[in-house]
Interface confidence: medium
């Protein structure tokens, strides 16, 4: 049987199951090679209390559909008197990149996972020409995710003192050079993730081969390199290079650009202190507030939820957007479909979309940038399900009494964005992590 | 590509104000960060000010903080540049520019340019 998702194969990747401190590892297509969970184990649970490790699916007893993956075992497991198997179930959803397994929950029986990755979609407009994974999990189990720095199109300029060249990077994947304007990065050779730019010619100078790494809780490395054999001729013999530091700040901050710290015959240090790679609960909640030491600063967008069926609207051309954040209020309009943001065509009232459901909530602070996400919508012709990425912004004079008005600012391959300047978006800052 | 038409300049007295208009035609006028740069006689062209398409932060050439303030208007897929408080210095061809390199103010990065409105700033 043919493996289902090939841009899966060549990596072993990682979920937690932070609450019973349970590590697994799971390999979709061969098997992971940790000796304690045997020779066909592609998903392998190590738990850290009890410092055992059993295989929880066996890569020879796979079943695949489009979007699910299960594997079995041979373990008898006891599930309400039913003799059943032991089983893992991998849940796919389409991505805009290939994502992280996310620990799901987990039975007597079955562990369950979901995973949002461009290897689900039912087209490819999503699909790198080489990306690696962009997470870790440090000694603590706990998640670093560059995912969201991951650019889908352009890229990231170097803070470099040389004025004749310009490098340019993205994160974990190539850039993509087709949706440039205009001439800068359209000459940068395809699979390139680091790409130098010389007057009118571009170089590849690094790809990438290996995921993400960690060095320390707050230093991740992420390596490319430059595959072919052929040097280029500034090089003095040395095939090109790219090391990317990532460091999580001592303390809250805005975001800063990466900079070039070391240079020398084409291999290229670069250190980016941005809170993205700091732990994921640092950054993130999946309700309405951020606070308590764990994140350093008090946020709460609660005062925000709409009650008694109102709902914001936003207007965006051929579309109205009705949003009610915070909360979990059917809106009108929107056919009993959880909708925290919910799409309606001005000139067909009746075609209405859900773009993000309000129990698939995301709250991030990072950078500086406040943004609420609403995820799980209605599914687009890619398979990717619609989503709101909601930019707040602090404006202590905001009207509607300091609550403001989210304002739709664009959509990009069914992801739809706003800003909402509100007082409530006022960050308060407290002591270093 | 996209297409950009500035609008809006013209002869105005030092204090005064303008207020600059680009429209944009195209590719998709969402996925760009956006960019107002001018050219004063004899001098290179140079940064004034930007925002990012997917929220609404923003960045200023030292030289216009506080009198300049750039926004924009996604329905009408049309960013402008109020100019308060002119000065002679400030005249220059005003341009606007699409960039999808984050993090720029180097005018190389921008990759779409309109042709230019004429700024004056005189007595």
């Known amino acids: 049987q043919a493996a289902p998702f090939p841009e899966l194969c060549s990596y072993t990747w990682e979920a937690v199951d932070t609450k019973n401190n349970v590590l697994y590892k799971i390999n979709i297509c061969g098997s992971v090679d940790i000796v304690q969970c045997g020779p066909s184990s592609a998903v392998c649970m190590h738990d850290l209390k009890t410092r055992t490790y059993h295989s929880v699916g066996d890569s020879v007893l796979r079943s695949a559909t489009r979007s699910l993956l299960e594997f079995n075992t041979t373990v008898s497991c006891d599930q309400q008197g039913t003799n059943h198997r032991v089983q893992s179930s991998i849940a796919f959803l389409c991505g805009k990149t290939l994502g992280t397994p996310e620990f799901v929950t987990a039975t007597e029986c079955v562990h369950y996972f979901e995973w949002r990755t461009t290897a689900a979609c039912k087209k490819d407009i999503f699909k790198a020409n080489k990306e690696v994974p962009c997470y870790v999990f440090d000694e603590e189990l706990r998640k670093h995710d560059l995912n969201p720095l991951i650019k889908l199109s352009g890229a990231y300029l170097v803070d470099d003192s040389d004025p004749d060249t310009s490098l340019f990077i993205n994160v974990c994947r190539d850039i993509d050079t087709l949706r440039d304007p205009g001439s800068q990065l359209r000459a940068c050779p395809p699979g390139t993730a680091a790409c130098l730019v010389r007057g009118h010619q571009a170089f590849d100078v690094g790809q990438p081969r290996d995921g993400l790494k960690v060095v320390r809780k707050d230093r991740l490395v992420l390596s490319y390199v430059r595959e072919e054999a052929g040097k280029l001729d500034f090089c003095d013999g040395h095939s090109p290079a790219v090391t990317i530091t990532f460091v999580c700040p001592s303390e809250r901050r805005e975001g800063t650009i990466p900079k070039l710290t070391a240079k020398s015959n084409c291999r290229y240090e670069i250190e980016w202190i941005t809170e993205y790679a700091c732990h994921r609960d640092y950054l993130e909640s999946k309700t309405c507030s951020l606070s308590g030491e764990q994140q350093d600063v008090s946020i709460d967008l609660t005062p925000l939820a709409q009650s008694g069926g109102s709902s914001y609207i936003s207007d965006g051309k051929e579309y109205l957007f009705y949003l009610n954040v915070c909360g979990e209020t059917e809106i009108q309009f929107c056919n009993k479909k959880q909708a925290a943001v919910c799409q309606v065509k001005k000139s067909d009232t009746s075609q209405v979309k859900a773009a993000g459901r309000y129990h698939n909530q995301t709250l991030r602070y990072s950078d500086g940038f406040l943004t609420l996400i609403y995820f799980g919508g209605d599914e687009c012709s890619s398979g990717f399900q619609r989503m709101s990425v909601i930019n707040f912004e602090c404006n202590k004079t905001a009207g509607n009494d300091g609550k403001g008005t989210p304002v739709f600012t664009g959509e990009v391959d069914c992801t739809y964005f706003f800003t909402w300047d509100t007082e409530y978006a006022c960050v308060h800052h407290h002591h270093h992590h | 590509d996209v297409q950009l038409v500035e609008s809006g300049g013209g002869l105005v007295q030092p204090g005064g104000s303008l207020r600059l208009s680009c429209a944009a035609s195209?590719?998709?006028?969402?996925?760009?960060?956006w960019g107002w740069f001018r050219q004063a006689p004899g001098k290179e062209r140079e940064f004034v000010a930007a925002i990012r398409w997917s929220s609404s932060k923003t960045s200023y050439a030292d030289s216009v903080k506080g009198r300049f303030t750039i926004s924009r208007d996604n329905a009408k897929n049309t960013i402008y540049l109020q100019m308060n408080s002119l000065r002679p210095e400030d005249t220059a061809v005003y341009y606007c520019?699409?960039?999808?390199?984050?993090?720029?103010?180097?005018?190389?990065?921008?990759?779409?340019w309109g042709q230019g409105t004429l700024v004056t700033v005189s007595s």
């Open positions: 195209g590719r998709t006028f969402n996925t760009y960060n």
């Open positions: 520019a699409a960039s999808i390199v984050d993090f720029t103010t180097n005018p190389s990065h921008f990759g779409s």
